[in-house]
Interface confidence: low
């Protein structure tokens, strides 16, 4: 059997244990919220909303100001003060449910757990490149609340998301808030709602569009929304909410809410419900068909993508695609599968599928039984009439009322399971040259840097590093400021660059200089990294051969040895084809003769695995001498390849140069028909690769070859006669003269 | 302008071999699954095998399954389809075709014009 | 193995006529479901993806419909250059399987 290089695991190129030290912001308290300015005079700022308390950060993340926001009733508030003299309501601390950019104005708009939910609103104020906030202006107007009809209260105790549209002059709050029974009893917050900020910062205008959880399904059927945004003509929120309004409210999925963004109003609401799953290339005994469903979206962000990602997708290039995190339930315990999955919905195909869904809805011929749906917000009835209508009348379109799409989109993991035990709490996405990467921040607080690509059965990583020591899990909110996000750890807020955070956890030269051209790694000298780390001997275009093992380790002094050396960067082609004159061995003072390779023994080599081999003759010189010595590959002139060319000397020691002594045989003598057990003996039998004893010049099949033995069975003789006897070593002559007497059998 | 071209087909014995070719251009080939399907004369259409971006998946019909071997060099922007122990039912005219890549839809979206393979003694 | 049914072999239509052909999959296929045309001597074209998604270049007089087992391609205004045969094909399981066609010829 011939002798095969051991595979090297593809994660040995790389170590994700090395730490990266990242700018950070300690917080004084669990980060609630975060979000981020910058300017068009290159002025910038970052907010850091904790209980009773928002801070205001450079780009530098050094504290500029900060702001208490709690608790109500506290005679310190800042913001509570902006509402005149009090009370305002029960007093108690102020957890931060929302903080968003208007960018029209621009100002930050926060609201509270506190005083109702309300909000209030901070003109920002740019001096130099920091920003201030100036004196808030509380959104509130005293005479226009009441507890059933609500305009400023915003925020809900339970959860709010809001996206911010400008819309003509005015700047429109589009809000989404998660209600139970208790909530909706005090200053009824509204599950959906469109509300247009007064011009003169006094609060919202009354009569405002909104949806709400029926008061009968408040008790069982509660809506978390995961994540809002804003992209073409329309505001999208992202919820994780029961299937059923009449079924186990334990049983949960994923819906898209689509608003549009044009006009303020909600008969064009549309509910779609997003389908993600893991479905393994093999499936399991006993696994659904179509794959394992992952119904609970845990974070969500909506990016442009790259080339790549956008032909796997076949959308064209810089078009937006949702992409969520999903898990198999609430707690995202373990499955079968992996923790965490992450779906893409390109954009385009959610407006087209809810298009589609209008369509079977409102047009002829009308499907018989399809829901309108939504059967928690408004009254059962079926398509193409009105909520709780059995008919359309003349003057009322079927269109101009909220619909849940009857069918679904469904999606699989991009990653194909790949993230495995890795629970994914916060994600960013990034388009970067023509890759797409995934920013995911995780349980255990770490940053993992992926790109978004289908086609692999492995992951390709920018980065995986811990952001600190305190292993707390990310928070789902992520902020981009320049080339940087920001992530939320506990009560830090850390600062990781959208390239990576560097190029040390690249152990080999040929992994470093794969790297993308976006990471800036380079190899010096024996470590990957940015230029800044290392200005000497930095550089971009070279690699040397790296030679990890070799077999033999020892071959006789006369006689040849095939040798097979193991590494990485021999050839930079998987055909191990070379060109003449590029690759020189040489064992001692010896060369080593390239050979050319047998293609019949080249074997796939799994990507999550490398080996290189490469094979030569070693035919000592004349010169060389008994012992211990190195084995050295050079090469040069190698073509360039994709990345680097390869150039340069490898050398391991370890090889010795013996020579092979025959002490003794026996038995001399044995039966004319062969079949004697010979045993030779003598020092460094086993050298070299290969060895034949010859009897009569016709060999003695080997039977055990050891350093101080060989046995071997004996050919049949043609006469009685005593016959030469001789060991060959790498096919030289072993010094000795034996002879073998065949005898009559 | 995505093209696909056939070559390699023709006339073959029962129990013989023949190599079909598929130049590509007008797309980076080395993005796409790509597809054999063939259809016989006065027939449908029949899958035959894919293979993916980086040749690492690879399916087949269970017709062909262990006669044919699909391969690709993304360099030369070529598929190829090497057909062993033919068979009189293999005749067909073979199309190479390109998976359309939305997400992970199996649909062809771009197909050569073709390359007759006739297996006939 | 899943089958995919088109119980019409023929149907015959005029121009302007809206024309519906149909493809039965013998177990749920979602909506992995595709539509081709093909013209004699021609290489297939992809009219619809994702049993509903036109595919892009298509005319929207065309657009398919169903999922699971029962699909439904439809031709709202049959235009001269429509004649041809339709093949669906499934990949929602391996082998990737096609229906053995539909002609649609001049009535």
């Known amino acids: 059997e011939d002798w095969q290089c051991p595979r090297t695991p593809y994660a040995a190129s790389r170590d994700f244990d090395v730490k990266y030290v990242v700018p950070s912001f300690s917080a004084g308290g669990l980060v609630q919220a975060m979000v981020t300015y910058e300017g068009d005079r290159n002025e910038s700022a970052v907010f850091v909303a904790i209980r009773n308390r928002l801070h205001v950060l450079g780009p530098d993340l050094k504290s500029v100001q900060s702001l208490a926001t709690g608790p109500a009733g506290d005679p310190g508030c800042q913001t509570c003060a902006a509402c005149g003299p009090g009370p305002h309501g029960p007093p108690g601390d102020t957890d931060t449910k929302v903080l968003v950019l208007d960018p029209a104005l621009p100002a930050l708009v926060s609201c509270g757990s506190s005083l109702q939910g309300r909000c209030f609103l901070h003109d920002l104020e740019p001096q130099g490149t920091a920003v201030h906030l100036a004196a808030p202006a509380c959104l509130f107007s005293a005479h226009h609340n009441r507890p059933d009809d609500c305009p400023d209260c915003v925020a809900s105790p339970l959860g709010t998301r809001v996206t911010v549209v400008e819309q003509g002059q005015a700047s429109y709050f589009y809000v989404a808030s998660s209600l139970d029974a208790a909530v909706a009893a005090s200053f009824s917050p509204r599950s959906v709602s469109i509300r247009r900020l007064k011009a003169d910062a006094s609060g919202f205008a009354p009569g405002f569009v909104a949806l709400s959880v029926l008061p009968k399904h408040l008790v069982s059927y509660s809506i978390e929304y995961v994540h809002s945004f804003h992209t073409g003509a329309f505001v999208y929120f992202l919820t994780v909410q029961p299937a059923s309004v009449t079924d186990d409210p334990s049983a949960l999925h994923t819906r898209l809410a689509r608003l549009s963004a044009t006009e303020p109003e909600l008969g064009d609401y549309r509910e779609l419900v997003l389908d993600c799953r893991f479905a393994p290339k093999r499936r399991r005994r006993g696994a659904p068909e179509g794959g394992q469903p992952y119904p609970v979206l845990r974070v969500a962000h909506s990016a442009p993508v790259g080339a790549q990602l956008a032909t796997e997708l076949s959308i064209a290039e810089g078009q937006e695609v949702l992409f969520g995190v999903f898990v198999t339930g609430k707690d995202g315990g373990p499955g079968v599968g992996p923790n965490s999955v992450v779906c893409a919905f390109p954009i385009d195909l959610l407006d087209t599928l809810i298009d589609e869904g209008v369509e079977r809805c409102c047009e002829s011929p009308v499907h018989p039984g399809l829901r309108r749906g939504l059967d928690f917000f408004q009254s059962p009835s079926f398509c193409p009439n009105p909520p709780g209508l059995e008919a359309l009348s003349p003057n009322t379109s079927c269109r101009h009322f909220p619909l849940l799409v009857s069918s679904s989109f469904s999606r699989v993991d991009l990653f194909n399971g790949l993230l495995g035990p890795v629970q994914v709490t916060a994600l960013y996405v990034t388009r970067l040259d023509n890759v797409t990467v995934a920013h995911m921040g995780t349980m255990d607080g770490r940053i993992l840097q992926v790109e978004l690509v289908r086609s692999l059965n492995y992951l390709l990583y920018v980065s995986n590093f811990s952001l600190g020591d305190s292993g707390q899990p990310v928070q789902r909110d992520v902020s981009r400021l320049g080339d940087h996000l920001l992530f939320a750890s506990g009560d830090q807020v850390f600062q990781v660059p959208i390239q990576g955070p560097g190029c040390r956890h690249f152990l080999t030269c040929g992994r470093c200089l794969r790297a993308w051209h976006f990471m800036g790694c380079g190899w010096c000298g024996n470590m990957c990294g940015q230029q800044k780390e290392c200005p000497g001997s930095w550089q971009q275009d070279h690699c040397p051969p790296k030679l990890t093992e070799f077999h033999p380790h020892s071959g006789p002094l006369r006689g040849s040895t095939r040798l097979t050396l193991c590494g990485s960067n021999f050839y930079l082609h998987p055909s191990g084809l070379v060109p003449e004159g590029t690759h020189q061995v040489t064992v001692g003072q010896s060369p080593c003769r390239p050979l050319p390779k047998d293609s019949s023994k080249l074997r796939p080599v799994p990507r999550k695995d490398f080996v290189e081999e490469f094979e030569c003759e070693l035919e000592p010189l004349g010169t060389q001498a008994v012992g211990p010595t190195n084995v050295s590959l050079t090469v040069t002139n190698m073509p360039p390849g994709k990345h680097f060319r390869v150039d340069g000397t490898s050398v391991l020691r370890g090889f010795s140069f013996m020579e092979p002594v025959l002490i003794a045989v026996q038995p001399l003598f044995g039966p004319r028909a062969g079949g004697t057990c010979l045993t030779l003996e003598g020092q460094s039998l086993s050298v070299g690769t290969s060895r034949a004893v010859l009897v009569n010049g016709t060999e003695c099949l080997l039977a055990r070859v050891s350093e101080g033995q060989l046995l071997c069975a004996t050919p049949p003789g043609a006469t009685v006669a005593s016959v030469p006897l001789s060991l060959q070593v790498g096919g030289a002559q072993v010094p000795g003269s034996w002879t073998f007497q065949y005898r009559e059998d | 302008e995505v093209q696909l071209v056939e070559s390699g087909g023709g006339l073959v014995q029962p129990g013989g071999s023949l190599r079909l070719s598929c130049a590509a251009s007008g797309f980076t080939f080395s993005r796409h699954w790509m597809s054999w399907v063939r259809q016989a004369p006065g027939k449908g259409l029949e899958w035959v095998s894919e293979i993916n971006p980086d040749s690492r998946t690879i399916n087949y019909a269970p017709s062909v399954k262990g006669r044919f071997t699909i391969s690709r060099d993304n360099a030369k922007n070529s598929l190829y389809l090497q057909m062993n122990s033919l068979r009189a039912e293999d005749t067909a005219v073979y199309y190479c075709?390109?998976?359309?890549?939305?997400?992970?839809?199996?649909?062809?979206?771009?197909w050569g014009q073709g390359t007759t393979v006739t297996v006939s003694s | 193995d899943i089958q995919l049914t088109q119980s019409q072999s023929f149907v015959s239509t005029s121009v302007g006529d809206r024309v519906t052909v149909t493809c039965r999959a013998s177990q749920n296929v979602g909506s992995s479901l595709v539509w081709y045309q093909q013209k004699p001597g021609k290489s297939p074209k992809t009219l619809i993806y994702?049993?509903?998604f036109l595919y892009s270049g298509v005319p929207s007089r065309f657009s398919g419909s169903g999922s699971g087992t029962e699909f439904t391609l439809t031709i709202s205004s049959v235009q001269p250059e429509d004649f041809a045969d339709y093949f669906c094909?499934?990949?929602?399981?391996?082998?990737?399987?096609f229906g053995g066609g539909t002609k649609v010829e001049i009535k």
């Open positions: 075709a390109r998976r359309v890549r939305i997400h992970y839809y199996g649909a062809m979206d771009s």
């Open positions: 994702s049993a509903s």
């Open positions: 094909q499934q990949y929602n399981n391996y082998p990737l399987t």
